[in-house]
Interface confidence: medium
């Protein structure tokens, strides 16, 4: 029987029931009871709250739910040997140290373990050195500095302002010029909103408060230890030597009164342009080394972290499909925190916690999902994404031949102004059609649906009166399953207007300060944000394992795709003259997205016309919309980068928060001017048309009539 | 750091056309992935998209101005332009050009300039 007979509801019935059955109350219950104690990967706590959740989940009404443990390589500081950042004079004597901890914020001072702010997987070390100011430490800052300004970062420490992109990136940049540390600061520029107070009185950052976070460059290997395969019970272990992802220098996070110490008495070059100037009183001069009167001092690093291979536990929650019960939908997000985790990460596990809820409820009443429903509470996302890689590498062939779509739960928000969402292309009409039944909770929406809302805050740069969806990049836990499994993934949550608020993040991201007071004190005092993104990751879920027919418009990948070849073969055009010289062609691709986008036309046409009574042939046409992701899958992987294997999107080489297009070709571009050999560069970017048209082509055919 | 400025007369006759300049300095207009638009703000109303010009060159008008819109672009002088003709006291706005993009945080607008529909 399907899951509709068996109950005599409707699906739309089935869907209402499900969504009124959330509540903000709810929500706003559960984020309190997560975020009173600190639960970093790794510690007694956090296993006690995945036991918690695991009981929690069971009173709610799955059919099951588990603990999957793994041994991991996680990172601590030394707790009698503290991590700090020093000006020493000529004597070596210490004239300035950087502070040792957070004050915490009201009501917290006597809470023990908070961990003091460190780099998660920082090389032990204490270089000492003349500081050069590199100001993101981007790609784009480094060319600046080195080929522009001719300044050597070589043996120096260099300090960068946390901000632009995913600080793993920063630190691999400045490994790549010979910098011998690097210390990272929240400028109030990017980290203290105009005409806000800071924590407590508003959310603004204090000039005490500290981003934490890991500064790895996995590139989706999870486990540094244990690349490709579970870091289980009889796991073989990588010696440190050959981890993958480690930084080779000493990295220390900072905020920015320590920042305002080291910045003032910077000499050397002024800042090129006004983008190397933040807030700070200060010259925001690159150095390298200290001003006329300070010339004789140096900065020195301190620090003493430890790697350790350490237990972490995910919980896996399952309810079981009536139908198709061997087609999963997979709702995750992490549990771990750096500290109190009042946004990252019990925003979005108080969401999850109230949707599990729900559809407990719906069972209990003896509704069944169509398909499987699996929840998941990862562990150990803050230092990398371990617990979701780690799961996924365990279970990769049930994955790969079984799942449908994986929807992510981090924060439910980073703002409170309007939606934001990035999925794949097959999921974009998912969305559109969810957020027009939904309830805006904006002010002055009042009557009107999320859609309404969302489009006139959010606006597409291409299709007037549609909303803004953007790539998948990384930097969470959908990573593995999309760019490594080829699985069709989604994300939303509530944001910020990105028009008037530039600063990156929220400000408190990854301090003592994200507390539950933080969200109902400034962010939602109502819940009523977090309720809407309860409704729209739960209402995509809920569609996804329920609708008869799965639903995916592979019609919006051939936009997308006509869209990414353009931008491709524009970045290539800046090249003429090479494209000549090197006979470079992008016919086949071009050729390849025409004939992906007649095929996707023609499927379409057929998916309404087929007779849906038919279970064989219904099964047929839904398999090959799920496969569809997975046929952008190549099993190589991208160069140098074996565990990101979608051909169309990959986290950008220079961001990994960021998602980059047809990324294969792209980095085969990039810079290919400054090239020692022009000819292999051009060879490469041959190549990686090739792989994509081949691509793009046989994942077409996967639409194809079968026979 | 990209920057945007806007320039024009800010006083136009009705009737007559709506001439306005955006300079970009800090990058390149023919960066691709961008979008170069321009929008407006009615006093004491939400911004109205006018329309943009795609790195590839692809333009996009709204269809309510589409009638009497020109959008270019000179990459040269790394710059694009707006065009408005028979404008009457209801184009009386200020006007902002935008870079956008793809993702999250592309979005870059310059400061403004008050353009009047006046006799």
């Known amino acids: 029987k399907s899951s509709n007979e068996a109950t005599n509801i409707t699906p739309k019935h089935n869907m209402k029931a499900f969504l009124d059955e959330l509540k903000a109350e709810n929500i706003k219950k559960f984020l309190y009871n997560f975020t009173q104690i600190p639960h970093l990967a790794g510690t007694e706590q956090n296993f006690q709250l995945a036991k918690q959740i695991q009981s929690q989940w069971k009173e709610f009404g799955l059919d099951s739910v588990e603990l999957a443990h793994y041994d991991v390589l996680l990172s601590y500081p030394n707790k009698t040997h503290p991590n700090y950042i020093s000006i020493i004079n000529e004597d070596g004597n210490e004239i300035f140290n950087t502070s040792l901890f957070e004050p915490p914020p009201p009501g917290y001072e006597n809470v023990s373990d908070i961990v003091p702010p460190f780099s998660a997987f920082s090389p032990q070390g204490m270089p000492e050195g003349d500081l050069v100011y590199v100001n993101y430490a981007r790609t784009e800052d480094f060319f600046k500095l080195e080929r522009d300004m001719k300044i050597n970062c070589s043996g120096k420490i260099v300090i960068a302002r946390y901000g632009k992109v995913f600080r793993g990136n920063k630190v691999k940049n400045a490994q790549l010029a010979g910098a011998k540390g690097v210390i990272l600061y929240s400028d109030p520029a990017d980290y203290f909103a105009p005409g806000v107070k800071s924590y407590p009185d508003g959310w603004n950052l204090p000039g005490g408060g500290v981003q934490r976070g890991n500064i790895l460059n996995l590139n989706g290997a999870g486990d540094p230890l244990t690349p490709g395969y579970p870091a289980n019970e009889y796991a073989y272990r990588r010696g440190i030597a050959e981890a993958v992802g480690l930084p080779s220098i000493p990295v220390h996070p900072i905020g920015y009164y320590d920042a305002q110490k080291l910045l003032e008495k910077m000499g050397g070059s002024a800042p090129p342009d006004s983008s190397w100037r933040g807030s700070l009183k200060v010259p925001y001069n690159v150095g390298p080394g200290f001003t006329g009167n300070f010339s004789t001092q140096k900065v020195k690093m301190h620090i003493h972290s430890t790697n350790e291979v350490t237990r972490i536990y995910n919980v896996i929650g399952t309810l079981r499909g009536a139908v198709e019960p061997d087609r999963y939908v997979i709702l995750g997000g992490h549990r771990d925190s750096w500290v109190f985790g009042g946004i990252d990460p019990q925003s979005g596990a108080a969401v999850v916690h109230e949707i599990v809820r729900s559809f407990g409820t719906l069972k209990k009443e003896g509704w069944r999902p169509r398909r499987t429903i699996l929840f998941a509470s990862w562990d150990a996302e803050e230092f990398g994404l371990l617990g979701s890689t780690e799961w996924a590498e365990e279970n990769s062939r049930l994955l790969q031949e079984r799942g449908v779509a994986y929807i992510n739960a981090d924060s439910s928000i980073e703002g409170n102004y309007t939606l934001r969402v990035d999925c794949t292309p097959l999921m974009y009409s998912l969305v559109h059609n969810l957020t027009k039944e939904l309830k805006s909770p904006d002010e002055g929406f009042e009557g009107k649906s999320l859609y309404e809302s969302w489009t006139k805050k959010s606006p597409s740069p291409e299709f007037s009166g549609m909303p803004r969806i953007s790539k998948l990049g990384s930097g969470n836990d959908f990573e593995v399953f999309f760019q490594r499994l080829g699985i069709a993934s989604g994300r939303a949550r509530y944001t910020k207007n990105w028009e008037t608020n530039k600063f990156s993040g929220y400000p408190l991201y990854h301090s003592v300060y994200e507390t539950y007071e933080l969200v109902e004190k400034f962010y939602d005092p109502m819940f009523k944000y977090h309720l809407t993104v309860a409704q729209v990751r739960g209402g995509m879920v809920f569609e996804l394992a329920n609708s008869i027919v799965l639903p995916f418009d592979c019609r919006d990948y051939a936009v997308v795709l006509r869209k990414y070849a353009d931008k491709i073969y524009s970045i290539s055009m800046k090249h003429p003259q090479e494209m000549k010289t090197y006979s470079v062609s992008f016919d086949s691709l071009f050729s390849a997205v025409k004939n992906f986008t007649e095929i996707a036309s023609k499927f379409s046409e057929r998916l309404q016309d087929f007779d849906k009574s038919n279970p064989i042939v219904l099964r047929m046409m839904n398999d090959q919309l799920m496969f569809l992701e997975r046929a952008f899958i190549d099993p190589l992987g991208l160069p140098d980068r074996p565990f990101y294997r979608h051909v169309i999107y990959a986290p950008s080489s220079h961001n990994k928060y960021a998602g980059e297009s047809f990324p294969g070709i792209y980095d085969a571009l990039f810079d290919i001017e400054s090239k020692v050999d022009p000819s292999k560069a051009w060879g490469e970017v041959k190549r990686q048309i090739y792989v994509a048209a081949f691509t793009v082509q046989a994942a077409a055919e996967t639409l194809s009539e079968v026979a | 750091q990209v920057q945007l400025q806007e320039s024009g007369p800010g006083l136009v006759k009705p009737s007559q056309t709506l001439s306005l300049t955006c300079t970009v300095s800090?990058?390149?207009?023919?960066?691709?992935?961008?979008?170069w638009s321009w929008v407006r703000q009615h006093p004491g109303k939400g911004l109205e998209w006018i329309g943009f010009?795609?790195?590839?060159?692809?333009?996009h008008y709204n269809p309510s101005l589409k009638s009497r819109v020109t959008i270019s672009v000179d990459t040269s002088k790394n710059q694009f332009s707006l065009k408005l003709s028979s404008v009457t006291a209801a184009d009386t706005a200020v006007y902002y050009c935008?870079?956008?993009?793809?993702?999250?945080?592309?979005?870059?607008r310059g400061q403004g300039t008050l353009v009047t529909v006046s006799s």
């Open positions: 010009i795609y790195y590839n060159g692809s333009i």
């Open positions: 935008a870079r956008d993009g793809d993702d999250y945080g592309d979005y870059l």
């Open positions: 800090g990058g390149s207009i023919s960066n691709s992935g961008y979008y």
